[in-house]
């Protein structure tokens, strides 16, 4: 899901910093300092070079741009705005570049941008208009098809006084710009919940990765609108049980494959419907690997092997009969 390049030959630039005053704009085919360029592969790689800003002299032919492993810190408005525009840039990988702030309009003037990877950046401040570029209620549609936001949660002491989930969702929903998004990866972000409106407003999604978060429940999440959804990754969360409404919605999606491994399933009476569903459904991949975590007597039991007699709940005693 990240930009890749062919094995075409790469030309390296001279090893000096591009900070000289220029009387004219860069030649369209020159390679920025500290980068490698292949015009044949339409690829520029500025990788692990401790760059503190996006090079100004990117060649106009660039289709795949790797800016990984740098120290960009802030991605300002128009970070990739050039004259002429980078009209061919389709895949942009900014992973692991110590970004902590992405400002409104950071990706403006990239008309062909299909893939964007911001993974492994501690994004304490992601503008609501980072992807839409406008504070209009309905923005011009973004060309983005894949948005990779794995492990973008900042350390706890660097987070703003607001919900991290809310900040990310605001950026995803602003101006309804991402209506064409097909792949969204949000793995490893310590998400405790999924705001209920997010999926309804991303109707084109084919692939959604929410693995390795801290999701406890999907009760308020609706998958009903995601009729094109093909894969839903929920592995390594804190899910205890999936309730009937969620099961029915997932079953109703025509192309779906769901991944549920490594969740702490609670095998009590509330699990009965899910077990019944698991035995019948084809949508869960590796369903034979799902095991109970609680209660203690059920630990490591395979969900598919349970029957209703196994799934009991301790009776709730009236207050007068409870002991301390």
């Amino acid at each position: 899901s990240s930009p890749t390049s062919s094995a075409s030959s790469f030309s390296s630039s001279a090893p000096f910093l591009a900070s000289a005053v220029s009387a004219q704009p860069p030649l369209p085919d020159q390679c920025p300092a500290l980068c490698e360029c292949s015009e044949a592969a339409r690829t520029v790689k500025c990788v692990n070079r401790n760059l503190t800003e996006v090079p100004t002299d990117l060649p106009a032919y660039v289709r795949n741009l790797f800016l990984t492993g740098n120290q960009l810190a802030v991605l300002p408005a128009g970070a990739f705005a050039r004259r002429p525009p980078l009209a061919e840039l389709a895949a942009l990988n900014l992973s692991g570049s110590r970004l902590d702030e992405v400002r409104a309009g950071a990706f403006e003037h990239l008309p062909s941008l299909r893939q964007l990877d911001l993974s492994h950046n501690p994004l304490a401040d992601l503008s609501p208009f980072a992807f839409s570029g406008s504070n209009a209620s309905v923005s011009a549609p973004s060309p983005l098809v894949e948005l990779i936001l794995n492990h973008i949660v900042p350390p706890e002491d660097e987070r703003q006084n607001r919900s991290f989930e809310g900040m990310v969702v605001a950026a995803l929903l602003a101006g309804r710009a991402l209506q064409g998004l097909r792949r969204l990866e949000l793995a490893s972000n310590h998400f405790l919940y999924l705001p209920r409106d997010v999926l309804a407003q991303l109707p084109s999604l084919r692939h959604l990765d929410l693995s390795n978060n801290s999701l406890v429940s999907l009760t308020y999440v609706s998958f009903r609108n995601l009729t094109h959804l093909e894969s839903l990754h929920l592995e390594d969360n804190a899910l205890k049980v999936l309730h009937n409404g969620t099961l029915a919605e997932l079953q109703g999606l025509p192309h779906i494959r769901v991944f549920l491994d490594n969740n702490p399933w609670v095998c009590d009476c509330h699990m009965a419907d899910m077990v019944t569903w698991l035995k019948e459904t084809e949508v869960v991949q590796g369903k034979d690997r799902l095991t109970c975590a609680y209660p203690e007597k059920m630990r490591n039991r395979v969900l598919l092997e349970l029957n209703s007699a196994d799934l009991d709940c301790d009776p709730i005693l009236p207050p007068s009969l409870q002991t301390s």
Epitope: S19, V21, R83, P84
Partner: antibody
Framework: EVKLLESGGGLVQPGGSLKLSCAAS????????MTWVRQAPGKGLEWIGE????????NYTPSLKDKFIISRDNAKNTLYLHMSKVRSEDTALYYC??????????????WGQGTTLTVSS | DIVLTQSPASLAVSLGQRATISCRPS??????????IHWYQQKPGQPPKLLIK???NLESGVPARFSGSGSGTDFTLNIHPVEEEDTATYYC?????????FGAGTKLELK
């Protein structure tokens, strides 16, 4: 309120030099690209050049790059245009201008009132 | 450099009628999402005023009787209905590449 105030124009002899200034106020000058545009009497607009916020990138129109130098002093909120070897065809009203966004300019929302340079012997 | 050919050089329009000004760049100045043409109005003794950016986006505070259209190498500024205060010179500008360039201008007068 954004304000741009050009100064330094006047009468100069052919071959002489002059430095125009543009004092900016009402915004964070150090964040914005700034631009010079000129207009000869009764003629159209001509883009002279631009300078980025930290002065690392300066672009000129090709025909003027050998005689004009654009600079800025962010501490003084001032943009400069240093003109040398001026000729009669440099007689014009000189405007400084600013875009509404803080990256390289595509268009100009804010303009000064201009300062007039007259080149004559 | 990109040359912007503006036409007509001048036109006279009756109050309430439509004024149409053309701007033709010497090469395409459009991507799939933006056209890098902008329109300005200049009245005597005043600096230019931005009317329209990116070919068709009306600048804040500009009356809705101004509109822009076009892509590639063919752009149009329309004013309808023309009002007395619209007497001015109109310029197009491209920001596709450096150097930025302006059209020669179109002078609009009232009949």
């Amino acid at each position: 309120e954004v304000k741009l105030l050009e100064s330094g124009g006047g009468l100069v002899q052919p071959g002489g030099s002059l430095k125009l200034s543009c004092a900016a106020s009402g915004f964070d000058f150090s964040r914005y690209w700034m631009t010079w545009v000129r207009q000869a009497p009764g003629k159209g607009l001509e883009w002279i050049g631009e300078i980025n916020p930290d002065s690392r990138t300066i672009n000129y129109t090709p025909s003027l790059k050998d005689k004009f130098i654009i600079s800025r002093d962010n501490a003084k909120n001032t943009l400069y245009l240093h003109m040398s070897k001026v000729r009669s065809e440099d007689t014009a009203l000189y405007y400084c201008a600013r875009p509404d966004h803080d990256y390289n300019p595509y268009y100009f929302n804010y303009w000064g009132q201009g300062t007039t340079l007259t080149v004559s012997s | 450099d990109i040359v912007l050919t503006q036409s007509p050089a001048s036109l006279a329009v009756s109050l309430g009628q439509r004024a149409t000004i053309s701007c033709r760049p010497s090469q395409s100045v459009s991507t799939s999402s933006n056209s890098y043409i902008h329109w300005y109005q200049q009245k005597p003794g005043q600096p230019p005023k931005l009317l329209i950016k990116y070919a068709s986006n009306l600048e804040s505070g500009v009356p809705a009787r101004f509109s822009g259209s076009g892509s590639g190498t063919d752009f149009t500024l329309n004013i309808h209905p023309v009002e007395e205060e619209d007497t001015a010179t109109y310029y197009c500008q491209q920001s596709w590449e450096i150097p930025l360039t302006f059209g020669a201008g179109t002078k609009l007068e009232l009949k």
